[in-house]
């Protein structure tokens, strides 16, 4: 049994961070694989990940983390029985994938103005919470040309489009994802979508 | 909102030992290491140590190895630090800090007055 | 003794920028993290900058911290006389065992 593809991990930077690899042929990641995982710092004890499978040989460990600041760093151990396959390191700073926004709403009771505001996915006490950036995309069910970008670089998790910026009289979709520019992040998943009926009264034409 | 609240005030005489608490709350216990330092009366701050809450692991400076002990106590949300072989030197603001690589939170600190 | 020297002093008039050095090794501030705190008289410490320049949340941006290879800097702009306090900088001595470890402290005064 070998590792085909070393592990790699992004961290959301809050509790969780996810590690995936490949081994060399169909491997029973749960029952034959352990990855032992452990904070360089006083006290810390070794904690263990049981991977799940993620494709025929590939597996997957969700590490739970207390408190995670930038100076930490963690050694990763990946074994197989009593046979250490991998020794590696992952310092969650360097590989953050923010957490998805979430509770994204559409209000559509303000005269022609659509607003759209989501929650952000980090407590005030996280370094990200003051530090993310979102883009919010919106498209039309009906026809998969009118698909849009807005990028929010402000802190507050809002947006604020003209309805007469889309089409009247038809349905769209919503979703936000987030990043952090400080950490040189990825962006996070999307969002769940939401969905919206746009109509808005047309301008007196004279 | 995060909070270390501490014992009061002690005055003891040398060769006696002291036990200092620090009850926390507003945020999950176990999650976050507690450390110990002292401020003696016009002096810098000086650690002493540190424990895991979550364990009970301890680690402490070497200058205040063998006369130490930190303590937890899950139930309540509360750590202790009790020095022993109490000496004169050993007057000083006792204060509780949570974090790990730096200190976010500290309790308002109690004063140990060691006097014959 | 602490092996992170600050200047006992500094003072600066209302308005004024101040900055204050702690000087380490490499064993110190050369290999790990530098944090910096606030203790306003008779008071408890206060975190003000983390991670060599990261300010929680609630601290003002005339705090503003910086590191250069074995010593650090913590800079105050706008000074206000709510700013008189000892300052300490922090560090992690990374030689044999990881302790922490606390700078000598300066005491600033707003003339």
């Known amino acids: 049994m070998k590792v085909l593809q070393e592990p790699t991990c992004v961290s959301d930077y809050m509790s969780i961070s996810t590690c995936e690899w490949k081994m060399n042929g169909p491997t029973n990641c749960s029952t034959e694989l352990r990855l032992l995982y452990q904070l360089v710092f006083l006290l810390s004890e070794a904690h263990t990940c049981i991977p799940e499978n993620n494709g025929g040989a590939g597996c997957v460990c969700h590490l739970l983390m207390d408190d995670v600041v930038s100076a930490d760093n963690y050694t990763l151990d990946l074994w197989a029985g009593q046979q250490l396959l991998w020794k590696g390191s992952f310092k969650p700073s360097e590989h953050v994938k923010p957490r998805a926004p979430g509770n994204l709403t559409v209000h559509t009771n303000v005269s022609d103005t659509l607003l759209l505001t989501w929650s952000n996915p980090y407590p005030p006490d996280n370094y990200l919470y003051n530090h993310l950036t979102y883009a919010v995309n919106i498209w039309s069910e009906n026809d998969p040309a009118d698909f849009r970008i807005y990028n929010v670089t402000y802190l507050e998790p809002s947006l604020r489009i003209a309805a007469s910026t889309l089409k009247s009289g038809i349905s769209y979709r919503a979703r936000v994802r987030a990043w952090a520019q400080c950490y040189n992040t990825t962006w996070s998943e999307w969002s769940p979508s939401t969905k919206w009926h746009n109509s808005y009264r047309e301008p007196f034409e004279q | 909102q995060v909070q270390l609240v501490q014992s009061g005030a002690e005055v003891k005489k040398p060769g006696a030992s002291v036990k200092v608490s620090c009850k926390a709350s507003?945020?999950?216990?176990?999650?976050?290491?507690m450390h110990w330092a002292r401020q003696a009366p016009g002096q810098g701050l000086e650690w002493m140590g540190i424990?895991?809450?979550?364990?009970?692991?301890?680690s402490y400076a070497q200058k205040f190895q063998g006369r130490v002990t930190m303590t937890r106590d899950t139930s309540t949300s509360t750590v202790y630090m009790e020095l022993s072989s109490l000496r004169s030197e050993d007057t000083a603001v006792y204060y509780c800090?949570?974090?790990?690589?730096?200190?976010?939170?500290w309790g308002k600190g109690t004063l140990v007055t060691v006097s014959s | 003794q602490s092996v992170l020297t600050q200047p006992p002093s500094v003072s600066a008039a209302p308005g004024q920028k101040v900055t204050i050095s702690c000087s380490g090794g490499s064993s110190n501030i050369g290999n790990s993290y530098v944090s910096w705190y606030q203790q306003l008289p008779g008071t408890a410490p206060k975190l003000l900058i983390y991670?060599?320049?990261k300010r929680p949340s609630g601290i003002p941006d005339r705090f503003s911290g910086s590191k250069s290879g074995t010593s650090a800097t913590l800079a105050i702009t706008g000074l206000q006389t709510g700013d008189e306090a000892d300052y300490y900088c922090?560090?992690?001595?990374?030689?044999?065992?990881?302790?922490?470890?606390f700078g000598t402290g300066t005491k600033l005064t707003v003339l």
């Open positions: 800090a949570r974090g790990k690589w730096w200190f976010y939170d």
């Open positions: 922090g560090t992690w001595d990374t030689s044999t065992t990881m302790y922490p470890l």
């Open positions: 424990i895991n809450p979550s364990g009970g692991s301890t």
């Open positions: 991670d060599n320049n």
């Open positions: 507003g945020y999950a216990f176990t999650s976050y290491y």
